[in-house]
């Protein structure tokens, strides 16, 4: 999906009002310096591409993020504010339903959510100095 035509300000508002708090709740008890940055993004569409990938694509050691509250709210925000996004996700959602797994918060998942926090911060904070 090409995120170029999303309403970035509306997505930013959704992040600030709820998604950010859900991410903090998920990470509670984890030191903010525990994980180094291993993923970045270079503009708002790119950030959303990487956020979608980390949030909804199962990875080795962390297959359970899509059912988390922050993930469901992320999905809702993208569906509302990115034209045509919902249609592209129907097949992916059906495949995910077949893959229901026991919910376990692994260290790998914590690391992945830490990376998500960094991506969302970049999405919301273009460089302080535009030079």
């Amino acid at each position: 999906y090409d995120f170029t035509n999303c309403d970035f300000e509306k997505i930013k508002a959704a992040y600030l009002s709820t998604i950010s708090k859900d991410l903090i709740t998920y990470m509670s008890g984890t030191k903010s310096t525990e994980f180094n940055n291993t993923v970045s993004c270079s503009n708002r569409p790119h950030c959303l591409t990487e956020i979608q990938s980390l949030t909804f694509n199962p990875t080795a050691g962390c297959a359970s993020l899509a059912k988390e509250m922050f993930a469901m709210k992320t999905k809702a925000a993208l569906a509302i504010w990115c034209p045509g996004y919902s249609e592209t996700q129907i097949n992916a959602t059906q495949a995910m339903k077949k893959r229901r797994k026991r919910k376990v918060t692994t260290n790998k998942c914590l690391e992945q959510v830490s990376q998500l926090q960094g991506l969302w911060r970049r999405f919301n904070r273009p460089l302080l100095k535009q030079q």
Partner: antibody, heavy 122, light 108 residues
């Protein structure tokens, strides 16, 4: 463990070519801008070239423009520097370095390789 | 093209504060990054975006930037701080990375 490992350095005659490679591991390579920086013996750091996260744009220092080419293969997590028409003044340790970017602005080099030595001598 | 000027050398007594400057035209409008390089090693980022510090760098390292001068401050200097220090900016007008000439810090 996030790591950059350079290879391909060596001794080469003036006018000849050399290809440096940089293997990335431990991070999502495709999301970072990548640079080459060099350091002549006993001298300071000199930036050489940059390539955007998606490979869509490159830029070079005036001293290497037209002779060096930076490329990347995001599927293999590798960065390359093709160096043609080498001169004695290109003798240096060559480092690859990772840099987050925002649009067309590059941020700090937060991860560096250990460097590979290139000596141009007849 | 944009030029960054650093003093070639700075000395500090153990336990004292060292200040390394980086001069550039209206540098305060740019984000300045600082690197430490010890002999035979690759550079290491110690301060980025003027004053932020990577999690692995001790609090003794700090930075500031305004007007035409950026400053790296190293408090409670230690023998292990002896190294070359480089400032760096991204010059968006020319799409070039610019490094200062480097400053050799000696802990007396």
């Amino acid at each position: 463990q996030m790591q950059l490992v350079e290879s391909g350095g060596g001794v080469v005659q003036p006018g000849r070519s050399l290809r440096l490679s940089c293997a990335a591991s431990g991070f999502t390579f495709r999301t970072y801008g990548m640079h080459w920086v060099r350091q002549a013996p006993g001298k300071g750091l000199e930036w050489v070239a940059v390539i955007w996260y998606d490979g869509s744009y490159t830029h070079y220092a005036d001293s290497v423009k037209g002779r060096f080419t930076i490329t990347r293969d995001n599927s293999k997590n590798t960065l390359n520097l093709q160096m043609n028409s080498l001169r004695a003044e290109d003798t240096a340790v060559y480092y690859c370095a990772r840099s987050p970017q925002w649009e067309d602005i590059f941020e700090a080099f937060d991860i560096w390789g250990q460097g590979t030595m290139v000596t141009v001598s007849s | 093209s944009y030029v960054l000027t650093q003093p070639p050398s700075v000395s500090v007594a153990p336990g004292q504060t060292a200040r390394i400057t980086c001069g550039g035209n209206n540098i305060g409008s740019k984000s300045v990054h600082w690197y430490q390089q010890k002999p035979g090693q690759a550079p290491v980022l110690v301060v980025y975006d003027d004053s932020d510090r990577p999690s692995w760098i001790p609090e003794r390292f700090s930075g500031s930037n305004s007007g035409n001068t950026a400053t790296l401050t190293i408090s409670r200097g230690e023998a292990g701080d002896e190294a070359d220090y480089y400032c760096q900016v991204w010059d968006s007008s020319s799409s070039l990375v610019v490094f200062g000439g480097g400053t050799k810090l000696t802990v007396l």
